[in-house]
């Protein structure tokens, strides 16, 4: 299958103090919340998380094999998967100059593919057929970015707490497709 | 224990004035950013306004803008609307809600307090 | 009429599973974050899911929520008899000056 993954380990995106990629435009006036022009918010702020780990953008690698048909890659990819949540509810103070935290709801963030990178791969096929040489794309780097109407649907897909939470005492597993999805996503090339 | 208690609900005039309050306590009050919501009698939620924790942090329903106005006094652990030119359509429950996370939600919410606008 | 469409009601037997669908369009739900909220007969609304899959502390996890483009959904598995109540979505739109709207309401029925 093409999601053999024999090695998964992970990485959490954590932004900067006081950064926020893609920060929402204020969509009403012009005033400035930015408290640090202002003498800043005491140390205990509202919106501190109460758990770092309730949001976190997250970076599965998983090291598989390519196939397309009977062919399969000579030599194992890495690849990451982009994982888990993103929200202001996370951030720090210095962050509030940039949107509406105090609202009920805002701008939704997903942990979505940011960088891809193209890598060219050897098939080997069976019954003694000559190897053939394909690019690959794969995800390179994953990142919270606003939801817009532009943005692959596929990409977008929520699975829910269950999901972006993998079970305590169970490996992460990447999310489970058809095989011909799959191969047609990696063998998308640049 | 977290409680928000709203009051000065009762009869009015179209056209005429009332103020509801809503007392909190149980939690830090400037922690949370403070909404009124309503419900008018066998209907769904709606939304009236809400506040930060300063007057520049205010927003209001199309339905209300320019009549209402939405106030805070963290010494006092008070939320106010202040309703003018009432119209029969603002007759509703309303209820005070808060929330202490961004994009959060109202987690926090109160019982409620009746407006009837009638003549 | 409100900005987010609901079905005005549904219904399922205990234990069943039972999905409330929420749909908006691209200046509320598709690029804002969906909660849910939970009334009970003559109470106060709850808060039951907030960003769009999060559930506060103390609400069961046989709620669920998701959202996928300008469309939400909350589910409810194990249906009980104390489920009953209206259930709303909300969310933030970004039209005009921007207000939280929410759905009409559904009022989910627990049978026999």
């Known amino acids: 299958q093409g999601w053999q993954a024999f090695k998964n380990d992970a990485t959490e995106i954590i932004p900067e103090l006081g950064e926020y990629p893609e920060p929402p435009p204020e969509l009403e006036n012009n005033k400035t919340m930015n408290r640090a022009e202002n003498g800043g918010r005491p140390p205990h702020h509202p919106f501190e998380t109460k758990d770092v780990s309730e949001y976190s953008c997250r970076e599965l690698h998983f090291t598989r094999y390519v196939t397309d048909g009977q062919c399969r890659s000579a030599k194992p990819v890495t690849e990451l998967v982009c994982s888990g949540q993103c929200g202001p509810a996370r951030l720090l103070p210095n962050a509030i100059g940039r949107g509406k935290w105090w609202r009920p709801s805002g701008p939704d963030f997903r942990c979505i593919p940011d960088r891809y990178r193209a890598q060219r791969v050897q098939l080997l096929c069976p019954g003694g057929a000559a190897p053939r040489a394909r690019k690959v794309r794969l995800v390179a780097s994953c990142k919270c970015k606003r939801l817009t109407r532009f943005h692959n649907q596929s990409e977008l897909k929520d699975f829910g707490p269950e999901a972006a939470r993998p079970q305590k005492g169970r490996k992460p597993r990447p999310r489970a497709r058809g095989a011909k999805a799959n191969q047609a996503e990696l063998e998308n090339a640049y | 224990e977290v409680q928000l208690v709203e009051s000065g609900g009762g009869l009015v005039q179209p056209g005429r004035s009332l103020r509801l309050s809503c007392a909190a306590s149980?939690?830090?009050?400037?922690?949370?950013?403070l909404h009124w919501v309503r419900q008018a009698p066998g209907k769904g939620l709606e939304w009236v306004s809400g506040?930060?924790?300063?007057?520049?942090?205010?927003d209001y329903a199309d339905s209300v803008k320019g009549r209402f106005t939405i106030s805070r006094d963290n010494a006092k652990n008070s939320l106010y609307l202040q309703m003018n030119s009432l119209r029969v359509e603002d007759t509703a429950l309303y209820y005070c809600?808060?929330?202490?996370?961004?994009?959060?939600?109202?987690?926090?919410w109160g019982q409620g307090t009746t407006v009837t606008v009638s003549s | 009429q409100s900005v987010l469409t609901q079905p005005p009601s549904a219904s399922g037997t205990p234990g069943q599973r039972v999905t409330i669908s929420c749909s908006g369009s691209w200046s509320n739900i598709g690029s804002n974050t969906v909660n849910w909220y939970q009334q009970l007969p003559g109470t106060a609304p709850k808060l039951l899911i907030y960003?769009?899959?999060q559930r506060p502390s103390g609400v069961p996890d046989r709620f669920s929520g998701s959202k996928s483009g300008t469309s939400a959904s909350l589910a409810i598995s194990g249906l009980q008899s104390e489920d009953e109540a209206d259930y709303y979505c909300?969310?933030?739109?970004?039209?005009?000056?921007?207000?939280?709207?929410f759905g009409g309401g559904t009022k989910l029925t627990v049978l026999g």
């Open positions: 909300a969310a933030w739109d970004d039209s005009l000056s921007g207000e939280y709207v």
């Open positions: 960003n769009n899959n």
């Open positions: 506040i930060g924790w300063d007057e520049d942090m205010i």
């Open positions: 149980g939690f830090t009050f400037d922690d949370y950013a």
């Open positions: 809600a808060g929330n202490n996370r961004g994009y959060g939600g109202l987690d926090v």
